[in-house]
Interface confidence: low
């Protein structure tokens, strides 16, 4: 046999106890690349966490947190509670978006409305706890002849933030 | 379902180079896994010849390792063996499977015959 | 590289007969050895790895056991579609080594 320890693939590792040989990584660990002088142990995804990819010899398990959670980190490292939209989380749990804020999400910051006279517009439909104003043309746009609302804006893909 | 499927010319020549396809279907060959040949002689023995892994990385059987290339068309889906060098002894069954700790789904196997 | 060798080339054995098929390995292979049944014109199927572990869909009537060096697969009760060509293969040690095969044959 070779010594093969600097070319163990993915999926093993070099095993010093075997004349530098590589060993297969023992069931619930991987090595994801090759080289390696042991194998890592799996993640459990366990309690708010689910696997959304079981563990093989060469990659890691991958989780997603349960209903009523969603992931936050680098690859998924925590789960954070769901609030319902018109909410946010605070230290004291899910609490209404004040006056003036708005969060159209389960998860995230309520934010303040759009402030449409910064614009020169003026508010053609009420912002609410879930949803922001909509803003409609400016005051002297609604002179007799003039087109009485603008198009509404194009709907956000849900889970990006207006800029 | 996972699926592959080995493709390439039936008879090459002693001294030129083999190449064979293998495409695989229901499983994107850079999700996970190591991706397989493996050739069976007439009389039925199997030789494990290489892997490339769902990362890029290779590994070779050291008696082919001089002969041996295996990569990958990430954009097809399909890993690919160049045997270089071929002689009749080269005449086998051509397999493509996928390794995990085993070998757990294998390609029909594609036929090539090494003569002038 | 590791020798795997099956002893018997051909075993021939009757339906409903409980059969054994041997493996022996050149060095401890630490029981990373699988099994693969190939039938006339089709490619390896795995039925055992890890020695003793099933593959999904594999009838239960095939079993693997054995540790060190030694490994064995048993058919407690065979059936027609049973006849095929049984490898062993052991997948501790690059370069991963196949043994020649044992031929079970129906009476």
């Known amino acids: 046999l070779q010594d093969l320890c600097s070319n163990c693939p993915a999926g093993t590792f070099c095993d010093n106890n075997r004349s530098q040989i590589c060993s297969p990584c023992p069931p619930n660990s991987f090595s994801s690349a090759g080289g390696q002088r042991t194998c890592d142990i799996c993640r459990q995804c366990k309690g708010v966490f689910k696997t959304r990819k079981e563990c093989s010899s060469t990659s890691n398990a991958e989780c997603d947190c349960i209903s009523g959670y969603h992931c936050l980190g680098a690859e998924c490292s925590m789960c954070e509670q769901d609030c319902k939209q018109g909410q946010e989380l605070t230290k004291k749990g899910c609490k209404d978006c004040c006056f003036g804020t708005f969060n159209d999400q389960k998860r995230g910051i309520c934010r303040p409305w759009t402030n449409c006279s910064l614009d020169g517009k003026s508010v053609l439909v009420n912002g609410t706890k879930e949803r922001d104003v909509v803003c409609g043309p400016s005051p002297a746009d609604l002179s007799p002849g003039a087109s009485s609302a603008t198009p509404p804006a194009p709907a956000r893909e849900p889970g990006h933030s207006p800029q | 379902d996972v699926q592959l499927q080995e493709s390439g010319p039936g008879l090459v020549k002693p001294s030129q180079s083999l190449s064979l396809t293998c495409t695989v279907t229901g499983y994107s060959i850079t999700s996970d896994y190591a991706w397989n040949w493996i050739r069976q002689f007439p009389g039925n023995r199997l030789e494990w010849m290489g892997y490339?892994?769902?990362?890029?990385?290779?590994s070779y059987n050291p008696s082919l390792k001089s002969r041996i290339s295996i990569t990958r068309d990430t954009s097809k889906n399909q890993f690919f063996l160049q045997l270089n060098s071929v002689t009749t002894e080269d005449t086998a069954t051509y397999f493509c499977?996928?390794?995990?700790?085993?070998?757990?789904?294998w390609g029909q196997g594609t036929s090539v015959t090494v003569s002038s | 590289d590791i020798v795997m060798t099956q002893s018997h080339k051909f075993m021939s054995t009757s339906e409903g007969d409980r059969v054994s098929i041997t493996c022996k390995a050149s060095?401890?292979?630490?029981?990373?050895v699988a099994w693969y049944q190939q039938k006339p014109g089709q490619s390896p199927k795995l039925l055992i790895y890890w020695a003793s572990t099933r593959h999904t869909g594999v009838p239960d009537r095939f079993r693997g056991s054995g540790s060190g060096t030694d490994y064995t697969l048993t058919i407690s009760s065979v059936q027609a579609e049973d006849l095929a060509l049984y490898f062993c293969?052991?997948?501790?040690?690059?370069?991963?080594?196949f043994g020649g095969g044992t031929k079970l044959e129906i009476k």
């Open positions: 060095q401890d292979v630490s029981t990373a």
């Open positions: 293969q052991q997948h501790y040690f690059t370069p991963y080594t």
């Open positions: 499977a996928r390794w995990g700790y085993v070998l757990d789904y």
């Open positions: 490339i892994s769902y990362s890029g990385s290779t």
